[in-house]
Interface confidence: low
């Protein structure tokens, strides 16, 4: 038999597991698809992003509703010959999530 | 030109992506390579884990010092023959992370 | 506050190098999108960028004086270093530090060098 | 190298006039990222350059309103709508958008 207390311990765990925004840092250069010359410092930023865990295999945690955020960041051009510019990056942050299922896939891709 | 406020936004915003033992979601299956007619209930639990943000593009986020803590969980077998099993599971939790060198390539890989 | 301050001598022979040192405060070399340079004005005449040096150590020289020129940083002491060999009479001007911003916001006093023997 | 070309040299201005200073550039001043890194300084006698207009129209902060710039590509103007007496020293505009950052030659803004 299981005591009830440990029952609630396993659950509190689970619900801190499930599908929902989380901080997350994300590297703004990949994420803006910028140009090798060009980076940013820093090079991450937090922002929420849907993670953590669904009940079935076939789900998968995904953003239901988005919002865009904006970071300041030195954008620096590769060689150093200007001065580094602060610019306002908008990176998105996610604001819903929810398990769904994987996009099916075509039986000859 | 920057103004000191700004920089220090920016410097804090930095702080917090830098690499550092972060609560993950961690797949309790995966995590301990069992067969596939093994499964935990929760399949997740929350774990500390190396991530963030390493100055350098040669570096990554690796931990350095590692303990193992117990959670209990339901071990399900598949077919249900007996009874949903508590057991303690033990898994990793990063204490200590670093950004260090990623491995050296061999020249032919 | 941000502030600059030159230091080297005033006089300097013909063909000697010239070591200036730049002590700033109000700001940290380690912060990212910092740089400190040196600009210098001969008397009468206008302003000529010499260098600069970024917080990451990368450095950019005016092509025109690149040869001739060394800028350097100690980022636990605040300062920066420029050094300009084989100096001549027409290098004689107050040379700046300044605080590598777009555009130069922080400027330092100036000190005025004389080359003469 | 960018030539950054001011006219008049020297300007004598008298208290309470608008007074005009040109800049001419060699090439565009308009850099990869839309920005035009023009700026406008004032060095008054015995100091160091202070300044006073950034990005070709935004007046540093502490500046008074009656100094304002325009312009775009190659061309750009300083004007001081009433002049005072305090407005006295040599003018300079400077470009940062191509290296090396050059300064113009200066215009000397005396009272009669």
């Known amino acids: 038999f299981y005591d009830i207390e440990t029952l609630k311990v396993i659950d509190e765990e689970w619900q801190r597991t499930q599908c929902s925004p989380r901080e997350t840092c994300v590297e703004v250069a990949s994420e803006l698809g910028k140009s090798t010359n060009t980076f940013f410092k820093p090079p991450c930023v937090n922002v929420f992003r849907c993670g953590g865990c669904c009940n079935e295999e076939s789900l998968i945690c995904m953003n239901t509703s988005t919002s865009y955020i904006s970071k300041q960041l030195f954008e620096i051009s590769v060689p150093l010959t200007s001065v580094p510019e602060l610019v306002p990056v908008k990176v998105a942050n996610h604001t819903g999530c929810k398990c769904l299922p994987t996009a099916p896939r075509h039986p000859y891709s | 030109f920057y103004d000191i406020e700004t920089l220090k936004v920016i410097d804090e915003e930095w702080q917090r992506t830098q690499c550092s033992p972060r609560e993950t979601c961690v797949e309790v299956a995966s995590e301990l390579g069992k067969s596939t007619n093994t499964f935990f209930k929760p399949p997740c639990v929350n774990v500390f884990r190396c991530g963030g943000c390493c100055n350098e593009e040669s570096l990554i986020c690796m931990n350095t010092s590692t303990s193992y803590i117990s959670k209990q969980l339901f071990e399900i077998s598949v077919p249900l023959t007996s009874v949903p099993e508590l057991v303690p599971v033990k898994v990793a939790n990063h204490t200590g992370c670093k950004c260090l060198p990623t491995a050296p390539r061999h020249p032919y890989s | 506050q941000v502030t600059l301050k030159e230091s080297g001598p005033a006089l300097v022979k013909p063909t000697q190098t010239l070591t200036l040192t730049c002590t700033f405060s109000?700001?940290?070399?380690?912060?990212?999108?910092?740089?400190v340079g040196w600009i210098r004005q001969p008397p009468g005449k206008a302003l000529e960028w010499l260098a600069n040096?970024?917080?990451?150590?990368?450095?950019y020289y005016n092509p025109v004086l690149r040869s001739r020129l060394t800028i350097s940083k100690d980022t636990s002491k605040n300062q920066v270093v420029l050094t300009m060999t084989n100096m001549d009479p027409v290098d004689t001007a107050t040379y700046y530090c300044?605080?590598?911003?777009?555009?130069?916001?922080?400027w330092g006093q100036g000190t005025l060098v004389t080359v003469s023997s | 190298d960018i030539v950054m070309t001011q006219t008049p040299l020297s300007l004598p201005v008298t208290p309470g006039e608008p007074a005009s200073i040109s800049c001419r550039s060699s090439?565009?001043?308009?850099?990869?990222?839309?920005?035009?890194?023009l700026h406008w300084y004032l060095q008054k006698p015995g100091q160091s350059p202070q300044l006073l207009i950034y990005?070709?129209?935004n007046r540093f902060s502490g500046v008074p309103d009656r100094f304002s710039g325009s312009g775009s590509g190659t061309d750009f103007t300083l004007k001081i709508s009433r002049v005072e007496a305090e407005d006295v020293g040599v003018y300079f505009c400077?470009?940062?958008?191509?290296?090396?950052?050059?300064f113009g030659g200066g215009t000397k803004v005396e009272i009669k």
């Open positions: 300044v605080q590598v911003t777009n555009p130069f916001v922080f």
């Open positions: 109000g700001f940290s070399l380690s912060d990212y999108g910092m740089g």
């Open positions: 040096i970024w917080w990451n150590d990368d450095k």
């Open positions: 090439q565009s001043l308009v850099h990869i990222n839309g920005n035009t890194y």
């Open positions: 990005k070709v129209s």
């Open positions: 400077s470009q940062s958008t191509h290296v090396p950052w050059t």
